[in-house]
């Protein structure tokens, strides 16, 4: 954990953003020539990402520590947060430039304009998250992470506008999980499925994570979840923690929060 610009940071990063994703050969890392990298992307219905597309993805949290081919024979990789083992301590696109030898072997950065996007890093004061394809049914085998990161001192008010996920007793198939932290390890609030609208949730700090997962079968209508930034309140007007959870929702697995 650390502070930068009044915002919490840690090392949870997106594997896909703004239509851009990383691919390597079946046999492992750094095995693709430029022509093969191009073929990999085209077989999946996309093409090699341009430098601009990779940078746009990086800006919303796309971070991969592996050099890959881009359009026009360029090689590089996107770094969101500098680290000792990757990116030479820099952020941005670590750019190896346009390669003269197109037979060099790297990974690939693909761009697929048709991909149903989900997830991202959000710093706006308000936003609505939708399941991929909403209002149409979401697809199988989806994993999406929405990381909310507001100004230090602000809190997050989360409300469920629409909610319809495959229902099962333990929410083991399709579910939304909420975390009162910037990752999906700490601060577990709850896991939700079914079609009952969960109660509003208010964070304890300036960060929150939503995770959506769907399994390999049975889909449903999906969801819309809204958040709004709550500005800090003065100490004199602060009461007890206003974080709420629903005791009435049978499709809710309670986390560490007390029920109010």
């Amino acid at each position: 954990w650390g502070f930068k610009d009044g915002i919490f940071h840690n090392s949870i990063w997106l594997e896909r953003a703004a239509g851009v994703y990383h691919r390597e050969a079946r046999s492992g890392k750094y095995k693709l020539t430029y022509a093969e990298a191009k073929a990999v992307c085209e077989f999946e219905g996309g093409h090699l990402a341009t430098y601009k597309q990779l940078e746009a993805a990086r800006k919303i949290g796309f971070h991969v520590c592996a050099a890959g081919w881009m359009a026009k024979g360029r090689v590089g990789y996107p770094i969101v947060k500098p680290g000792p083992n990757c990116g030479f301590g820099k952020t941005g696109i670590i750019d190896y430039g346009i390669r003269l030898n197109r037979s060099e072997r790297w990974d690939a950065y693909c761009y697929n304009p048709h991909a149903k996007e989900c997830g991202g890093v959000f710093t706006d004061p308000k936003q609505i998250f939708k399941s991929p394809g909403f209002p149409n049914e979401y697809e199988d085998n989806q994993i999406c992470y929405w990381h909310i990161r507001l100004k230090y001192g602000q809190r997050i008010h989360l409300s469920f506008l629409d909610f319809d996920l495959e229902d099962d007793p333990g929410c083991l198939a399709d579910y939304v999980e909420i975390y009162d932290s910037y990752d999906d390890v700490h601060g577990f609030v709850g896991r939700y499925c079914g079609d009952e609208l969960p109660d509003d949730i208010i964070s304890t700090g300036n960060v929150m994570t939503l995770k959506f997962l769907s399994d390999a079968s049975v889909t449903a209508g999906g969801f819309q979840i809204k958040y709004v930034a709550m500005d800090p309140v003065s100490k004199s007007s602060q009461g007890k923690n206003t974080s709420t959870t629903s005791t009435g929702n049978k499709n809710f697995l309670a986390g560490r929060f007390s029920h109010l």
């Epitope: 691919r23 050969a25 079946r26 046999s27 095995k31 693709l32 093969e36 073929a39 990999v40 085209e42 077989f43 999946e44 219905g45 048709h114 991909a115 149903k116 697809e139 199988d140 085998n141 390999a216």
Partner: antibody, heavy 120, light 106 residues
Framework: QVQLQQSGAELAKPGASVRLSCQAS????????MHWVKQRPRQGLEWIGY????????KCHQKFKDKATLTADKSSNTASMQLSSLTYEDSAVYYC?????????????WGQGTTLTVSS | ENVLTQSPAIMSASPGEKVTMTCSAT?????MHWYQQKSSTSPKLWIY???KLASGVPGRFSGSGSGNSYSLTISSMEAEDVATYYC?????????FGAGTKLELK
């Protein structure tokens, strides 16, 4: 165990359309790609195209672009191929074959084949 | 289109004999794969990624090659090896098969 069960033999008239199906079992349907391969009597194998069930994206060999339409139904784990405007040259055995999504591709499991006979 | 040329088209071998068939590609590929097909049955994956034997394939089979030239070898021919063998490339669109080498028993 992995199985690809194809629909039964078809007899169709020239100009008609036919839909062949391939039901997958024993693995997660959406994590692999499904390809279709044609084999005319006493001849070699010819790749038709593939579908990525997770996204629905499909692509056919240019030669089959106006002939074959590939679809996948995730709820029934079934891939299908519709062949249109049938001619005698479409008489063949058609196989579905699974490939990994990892490049470069190869087919690790095949269906038993569907025999299509086009005859007036 | 990456055309795969297999040779010979037909060959016969006596039991115990060493057998080699080749596959040449018009464009370089990183791996070649091989399928075995016996009459009236579906093809079976036989060798993948140039030299890896598929599950259940006897150890007398081997594959080698790189770039544009690949081969399948049987160290000691057996009666059950009678079949047609197809090479296949999955690197370039469109995916392509060779025309096959038919292996018979002498």
């Amino acid at each position: 165990q992995v199985q690809l069960q194809q629909s039964g033999a078809e007899l169709a008239k020239p100009g008609a359309s036919v839909r062949l199906s391939c039901q997958a079992s024993g693995y997660t349907f959406t994590t692999y790609w499904m390809h279709w391969v044609k084999q005319r009597p006493r001849q070699g194998l010819e790749w038709i195209g593939y579908i990525i069930p997770s996204s629905g994206y499909s692509k056919c060999h240019q030669k089959f672009k106006d002939k074959a339409t590939l679809t996948a139904d995730k709820s029934s784990n079934t891939a299908s191929m519709q062949l249109s405007s049938l001619t005698y040259e479409d008489s063949a055995v058609y196989y579905c074959a699974r490939s990994t999504s990892g490049y470069p591709y190869y087919f690790d499991y095949w269906g038993q084949g569907t025999t299509l006979t086009v005859s007036s | 289109e990456n055309v795969l040329t297999q040779s010979p088209a037909i060959m016969s071998a006596s039991p115990g004999e060493k057998v080699t068939m080749t596959c040449s590609a018009t464009s370089s590929v990183s791996y070649m794969h091989w399928y075995q097909q016996k009459s009236s049955t579906s093809p079976k994956l036989w060798i993948y990624d140039t030299s890896k034997l598929a599950s259940g394939v006897p150890g007398r089979f081997s594959g080698s090659g790189s770039g544009n030239s690949y081969s399948l070898t049987i160290s000691s021919m057996e009666a059950e090896d009678v079949a047609t063998y197809y090479c296949f490339q999955g690197s370039w669109y469109p995916l392509t098969f060779g025309a096959g080498t038919k292996l018979e028993l002498k």
